[in-house]
Amino acid sequence: GKGDPKKPRGKMSSYAFFVQTCREEHKKKHPDASVNFSEFSKKCSERWKTMSAKEKGKFEDMAKADKARYEREMKTYIPPKGETKKKFKDPNAPKRPPSAFFLFCSEYRPKIKGEHPGLSIGDVAKKLGEMWNNTAADDKQPYEKKAAKLKEKYEKDIAAYRAKGKPDAAKKGVVKAEKSKKKKEEEEDEEDEEDEEEEEDEEDEEEEEDDDDE
């Protein structure tokens, strides 16, 4: 399902458009030079930080247009069979538990945003990542313990939710169920990863709204 060539290309952020433009400019100036990507990314990031809102506006417009394109294409996109399971997301299903880092971010995001009101979501995330990396293992432990507890609770809740929500499963053959169990778990792991990304996107969107208020 992941490699469907007909699937619309993912939407690009304003920063991604900026990096793309940087790359094109670099290619024009140095057509034969090989690019040191970490150095190139660093330079792009530094340049982006110093850019005014007006300069960034062009790339934000490109991102908005691309978002509209993506949403338009997704409306008409029909995923291959077996991929439709993603469409319905039960609001009553237990919510995926946050990771230790996610819990840490919830603690310190207000401080970072409050001390640097002009920072973009990406830069806030970067600062939080730096904070987490610099946090001693001993100070990370409580977050890891809490995340583990929440994960344990989630696993119990999801097991109960699945048992309650699939009464027709009992009718199907036990052998068949066992066979498909491993495959199902793999799919769910994939789905969980996607869910987490979606949750983070949702939070970023909320933050964007917060930023507008500030």
Partner: antibody, heavy 121, light 111 residues
Framework: EVQLLESGGGLVQPGGSLRLSCAAS????????MVWVRQAPGKGLEWVSS????????IYADSVKGRFTISRDNSKNTLYLQMNSLRAEDTAVYYC??????????????WGQGTLVTVSS | DIQMTQSPLSLPVTPGEPASISCRSS???????????LDWYLQRPGQSPQLLIY???NRASGVPDRFSGSGSGTDFTLKISRVEAEDVGVYYC????????FGQGTKVEIK
């Protein structure tokens, strides 16, 4: 100006209880991790307990685990330390301090003036 | 637990002269990020402690530049280039890599 003002200290019998408060002002209290540190008469400093900004995670020194409870009320800009089953060795000046996270590297940048707790019969 | 050992425990000083306090930890305080998780505090007589140095060598705001911190791993030093009368008190080192532990303190007094 950052200010931390402890209160609630006093004389208590062994096995008794006491609740210390630390009123914070001059900064956004809800952004900061906070700690309690104590100092027995004529002795050195000992870290007692820490609490994260939301109050959702608390950490204790082994010497007070199970007896002391740290908490906070961000709406009142106040930090608390509930001390139960007090022992003579808990006699000390109790300081609250703010934890500054310099990109994750912690240090105690502001301290209160302290409140004296005496456990004696 | 990480043990912190300071020396000397008492340091008589002469105003205008330099002074030096040593702090040793039972385990390395050097984090993978290259920073040492060690701070220095001063407690003046009858006062609460105040931060002098954080992360081994960074002077806290408002701290005079005669104070400097150095060292890495398990051996650290706090130096006062020219002691002044207001520098008297007890100096503590504190590690924040594993929980929090302070050294026993070094009492600095004028000769």
């Amino acid at each position: 100006e950052v200010q931390l003002l402890e209160s609630g200290g006093g004389l208590v019998q062994p096995g008794g209880s006491l609740r210390l408060s630390c009123a914070a002002s001059g900064f956004t209290f809800s952004w900061y991790k906070m700690v309690w540190v104590r100092q027995a008469p004529g002795k050195g400093l000992e870290w007692v307990s820490s609490i994260v900004p939301s109050g959702g995670i608390t950490i204790y020194a082994d010497s007070v685990k199970g007896r002391f409870t740290i908490s906070r009320d961000n709406s009142k800009n106040t930090l608390y330390l509930q001390m139960n089953s007090l022992r003579a060795e808990d006699t000390a000046v109790y300081y609250c301090a703010r934890v500054q996270q310099w990109l994750g590297r912690p240090y105690f940048d502001y301290w209160g003036q302290g409140t004296l707790v005496t456990v004696s019969s | 637990d990480i043990q912190m050992t300071q020396s000397p425990l008492s340091l008589p000083v002469t105003p205008g002269e330099p002074a030096s306090i040593s702090c040793r930890s039972s385990q390395s305080l050097l984090h993978g990020n290259g920073y040492n998780y060690l701070d220095w505090y001063l407690q003046r007589p009858g006062q609460s402690p105040q931060l002098l140095i954080y992360s081994g060598s960074n002077r806290a705001s408002g701290v005079p530049d005669r104070f400097s911190g150095s060292g890495s791993g398990t051996d650290f030093t706090l130096k006062i280039s020219r002691v002044e009368a207001e520098d008297v008190g007890v100096y503590y080192c504190m590690q924040s890599l594993q929980s929090r532990t302070f050294g026993q303190g070094t009492k600095v007094e004028i000769k």
